[in-house]
């Protein structure tokens, strides 16, 4: 029977800098029931708080709701693993909410083959941002990403669409059935899921020709 | 620059007491976790004990247990070591170590030592 | 506790030539491992932490590797100045352990 090991923060995610959580992996075994706490401070302060809630998400994890999540302010986090051995501590972790946003897929993808008369025909694509994020504020600004691929295919054709919500591809090919996905980061932070795929039926008289 | 100078070292008989000071300089050391650890003449090292930033979580190695005391000061930038019961076994250079962090960690900087020798 | 064991005891060696020591826990300690050098007369000093990462300042000759039980400290080329004691430690448990050192000397 040993103390327990050395636990590691090893993840701090925020689907909209208005919440966020953390999740630690626990360190080895000592044989022993062991019980994990996770402490901070704000930088610029010493007083020391327990994690708001354990619960939200799900085990190793800590959850900070509204009334304990700051944009502009540096959390300072440490994980401690207590047994009837003796305990452990993580090393700290710094967090500023604003550096660890991954929002929610964007909603609503919409594919549509166009064929107008005059131009060359088209994939329109459109979608939503996420329901969690407020663009309307200013604080963020979503860069999108869009991949597809023939159903068989092994390769994804990925195209960048800055900030629009809609995109067009002229070049696909005639007869294929495509999957299309779209994925969202804000401008500091991570790249959300990819969204369901869905598929779109690209018709044989589609033509790439001008 | 990062100073770890230790002192309070010397020749004791066994059975009596010995209180070693380390004095730390060139960084903030409430950052710190902070650390005594031994050489006995021509052996390897020994962790003795360590003390978390906030004196919060303190520990001993085996040997020592019940007969050492780490404490430290934060306002005087000082850690300590206070040796009750000495033993010849004791007899060794006692070295300051800083933890590369608050709680649990490894070592980053070492002070140059000091020599206890327990002996009759 | 948690023992860790090196090994060879003692190396001897030549400049330029490829030197490994290896360090085993007792028990499962993760990545949580340190390797120092140590000069007669002079404290240590770390080399490597967190089993693989390269202290700031030194020599990229110096390389750490292994995971769980099992550590390795490699030189890729000795040098004049690397002719010293080598320990491993574990920091996975707040009670710190010492591996019992391997010196290399020279050939």
């Known amino acids: 029977q040993l103390p327990p090991g050395k636990p590691e923060i090893f993840k701090c995610r925020s689907p909209n800098k208005e919440t966020f959580t953390c999740w630690w992996r626990p360190g080895t075994d000592g044989g022993l029931p062991t019980n994990y706490s996770l402490t901070y401070h704000r930088e610029g302060e010493t007083l020391m708080h327990e994690c708001p809630d354990y619960i939200t998400g799900g085990p190793n994890s800590c959850h900070f709701g509204k009334q304990y999540t700051s944009m502009w302010r540096t959390y300072i986090m440490m994980v401690n693993a207590t047994n009837q051995m003796g305990s452990s501590f993580s090393d700290e972790l710094y967090v500023d909410v604003t550096y660890i946003v991954q929002p929610d897929p964007p909603l609503e993808l919409a594919v549509e083959v166009k064929q107008p008369e005059d131009r060359k025909p088209y994939l329109w694509i459109k979608w939503s941002p996420p329901t969690l994020i407020d663009l309307k504020t200013g604080w963020f600004t979503l860069l999108y990403e869009i991949r597809l691929k023939p159903e068989k295919a092994a390769e994804w054709e990925i195209h960048f669409a800055g900030q629009q919500t809609e995109f067009k591809i002229l070049s696909l090919h005639p007869g294929q059935k495509y999957l299309v996905q779209v994925r969202c980061k804000p401008d500091h932070g991570y790249w959300s899921a990819w969204s369901p795929a869905t598929f779109i039926q690209i018709p044989s008289d589609f033509t790439m020709n001008d | 620059e990062v100073q770890l100078v230790e002192s309070g070292g010397g020749l004791v008989q066994p059975g009596r007491s010995l209180r070693l000071s380390c004095a730390a300089s060139?960084?903030?050391?409430?950052?710190?976790?902070m650390h005594w650890v031994r050489q006995a003449p021509g052996k390897g090292l020994e962790w003795v004990s360590g003390i978390i930033w906030n004196s919060g979580h303190i520990g001993y190695g085996d040997s020592v247990k019940g007969r050492f005391t780490i404490s430290r000061d934060n306002a005087k930038k000082s850690l300590y070591l206070q040796m009750n019961s000495l033993r010849a076994e004791d007899t060794a250079l006692y070295y300051c170590a800083r933890d590369s962090g608050r709680y649990q960690s490894y070592f980053d900087y070492w002070g140059q030592g000091t020599l206890v020798t327990v002996s009759s | 506790d948690i023992q860790m064991t090196q090994s060879p005891s003692t190396l001897s060696a030549s400049v330029g030539d490829r030197v490994t020591i290896t360090c085993r826990a007792s028990?499962?300690?993760?990545?949580?491992l340190a390797w120092y050098q140590q000069k007669p007369g002079k404290a240590p000093k770390v080399l490597i932490f967190k089993a693989s990462s390269l202290e700031s300042g030194v020599p990229s000759r110096f390389s750490g590797s292994g995971s769980g039980t099992e550590f390795t400290l490699t030189i890729s080329s000795l040098q004049p100045d690397d002719f010293a004691t080598y320990y491993c430690?574990?920091?996975?448990?707040?009670?710190?352990?010492f591996g019992q050192g391997t010196k290399v000397e020279i050939k």
């Open positions: 028990h499962i300690i993760s990545s949580w």
């Open positions: 060139g960084f903030t050391f409430d950052d710190y976790a």
């Open positions: 430690q574990q920091y996975n448990t707040y009670s710190r352990t």
